[in-house]
C-alpha cells in the first residue's frame, strides 16, 4: 500500500533570465528512494539515481543544474519555460510517486508592475 | 560482467526493414542508457539515437528519424532498433553501447546490415 | 550540431615513442555544474567494436593502460600515449556527449613508422 505524500512548491514564478529552483519531497512512507526523474511536459530534464547519480538530459545541460538535493535548479529562464514540471519518485517496495509544479515566468518586475498598475 | 550480445547478420532488399537487438546482461538493464551507432564500410562512426529502458524516453539523430525506431523490453533486457526504407546506404555494421552519464562504456559485437537488391 | 576536428589523419610513430592526437570541438564541452569536459576517446581495431579508453576528456577508463592519457578542457582535447606498443596500432575517435546528437571525429589512424 502506498501511503507517502509528496509535496512540492506548488505553483511558483520567476522573472525571465533569472534562475529557480524546483523542489519535491516525499513524506509518509519508509520506502526506499532508487531514482528520481524530472520532465517538463513528458521532456526528459534530468535523472537522479541513487547507485549512479545525476543525468542531466544532454538537450538541458546548459539551462538545467543538478540539487540542490534531489531538486533541479533551472537557469537563464524564458517565457517558453512556463508550464508544468513533474517529479517522479521511483521507491522499493511502493512504486511511483509524481508531484507537480507548475512554473510561470515572467518579464522583467517593471514590466511585470507595468501591467498590474496602469496610470489613470 | 556486463555484456551486450547483438543479434547475427542480415541482408536485407532496397525498400525493406531490419530489426537489430541488443540483449544486456550484468548489470541493471534499466539504470542505463542504450545508445545505437552506425559505422559504414571504412568509414567513421555515427550516432544513431539512445533510449532509456527505465523510462519512455527516447532521443533521434534527425538523420535518422522517422526512419529509426527504438524499443525496449525489460522483461528480456533486450534494446530493439528498427530501421525502415532501407537503401544501399544503410549498409554497415550497426553497434549499440551502454551509457549513463560519463560515457559509453561497454559495446556489442556489431551487427552487420547489408542491403542489397 | 557540435563538429569533432581531429588531427592528423593518419599518425606514424616508431614503438616506444611518443603518439598525440588532437581533437577540437566547435562549441564548448564544459559542464559548468561539474566543471567536467564531456568527452571521450575510444580506439578501434579492425573486425572489433570501439573500446573506451578515456571519458570527461582526462579520466582513465578502468584496465586501460596507464600510457594512454586525456587532457584539454572546452574545446580543445589531446590523447597522448607516451610509449607506443605493438597493440596501440588502431583508430582513434574522439566523442563529444554534451549535447544531441553525440557526435565523433573522422578518426586517426595510428600506424608504425
Known amino acids: 500500500m502506498m501511503t507517502g505524500t509528496i509535496e512540492t512548491t506548488g505553483n511558483i514564478s520567476a522573472e525571465k533570465g533569472g534562475s529557480i529552483i524546483l523542489q519535491c519531497h516525499l513524506s509518509s512512507t519508509t520506502a526506499q528512494v532508487t531514482q528520481v526523474n524530472w520532465e517538463q511536459q513528458d521532456q526528459l530534464l534530468a535523472i537522479c539515481n541513487a547507485d549512479l547519480g545525476w543525468h542531466i538530459s544532454p538537450s538541458f545541460k546548459d539551462r538545467v543544474a543538478p540539487g540542490p538535493g534531489l531538486g533541479l535548479t533551472l537557469q537563464s529562464l524564458t517565457v517558453n519555460d512556463t508550464g508544468e514540471y513533474f517529479c517522479i519518485y521511483h521507491t522499493y517496495p511502493d512504486g511511483t510517486y509524481t508531484g507537480r509544479i507548475f512554473l510561470e515566468v515572467l518579464e522583467s518586475s517593471v514590466a511585470e508592475h507595468g501591467a498590474r498598475f496602469q496610470i489613470p | 560482467q556486463v555484456q551486450l550480445v547483438q543479434s547475427g547478420a542480415e541482408v536485407k532488399k532496397p525498400g525493406a526493414s531490419v530489426k537489430v537487438s541488443c540483449k544486456a546482461s550484468?548489470?541493471?538493464?534499466?539504470?542505463?542508457?542504450i545508445h545505437w551507432v552506425k559505422q559504414a564500410p571504412g568509414q567513421g562512426l555515427e550516432w544513431i539515437g539512445d533510449?532509456?529502458?527505465?523510462?519512455?524516453?527516447?532521443n533521434y539523430n534527425e538523420k535518422f528519424r522517422g526512419r529509426v525506431t527504438l524499443t525496449a523490453d525489460t522483461s528480456t533486457s533486450t534494446v530493439y532498433m528498427e530501421l525502415s526504407s532501407l537503401t544501399s546506404e544503410d549498409t554497415a555494421v550497426y553497434y549499440c553501447?551502454?551509457?549513463?552519464?560519463?560515457?559509453?562504456?561497454?559495446w556489442g559485437q556489431g551487427t552487420t546490415v547489408t542491403v542489397s537488391s | 550540431d557540435i563538429v569533432m576536428t581531429q588531427s592528423p589523419d593518419s599518425l606514424a610513430v616508431s614503438l616506444g615513442e611518443r603518439a598525440t592526437i588532437n581533437c577540437k570541438s566547435s562549441?564548448?564541452?564544459?559542464?559548468?555544474?561539474?566543471?567536467?569536459?564531456?568527452l571521450a576517446w575510444f580506439q578501434q581495431k579492425p573486425g572489433q567494436p570501439p573500446k573506451l579508453l578515456i571519458y570527461?576528456?582526462?579520466t582513465r577508463e578502468s584496465g586501460v593502460p596507464d600510457r594512454f592519457s586525456g587532457s584539454g578542457s572546452g574545446t580543445d582535447f589531446t590523447l597522448t600515449i607516451s610509449s607506443l606498443q605493438a597493440e596501440d596500432l588502431a583508430v582513434y575517435y574522439c566523442?563529444?556527449?554534451?549535447?544531441?546528437?553525440?557526435?565523433f571525429g573522422a578518426g586517426t589512424k595510428l600506424e608504425l613508422k
Open positions: 553501447a551502454r551509457y549513463y552519464e560519463s560515457a559509453m562504456d561497454f
Open positions: 550484468g548489470y541493471t538493464f534499466t539504470n542505463y542508457w
Open positions: 533510449i532509456y529502458p527505465g523510462g519512455r524516453y527516447s
Open positions: 562549441q564548448n564541452l564544459l559542464y559548468n555544474s561539474n566543471q567536467k569536459s564531456y
Open positions: 570527461w576528456a582526462s
Open positions: 566523442q563529444q556527449y554534451y549535447n544531441y546528437p553525440f557526435t
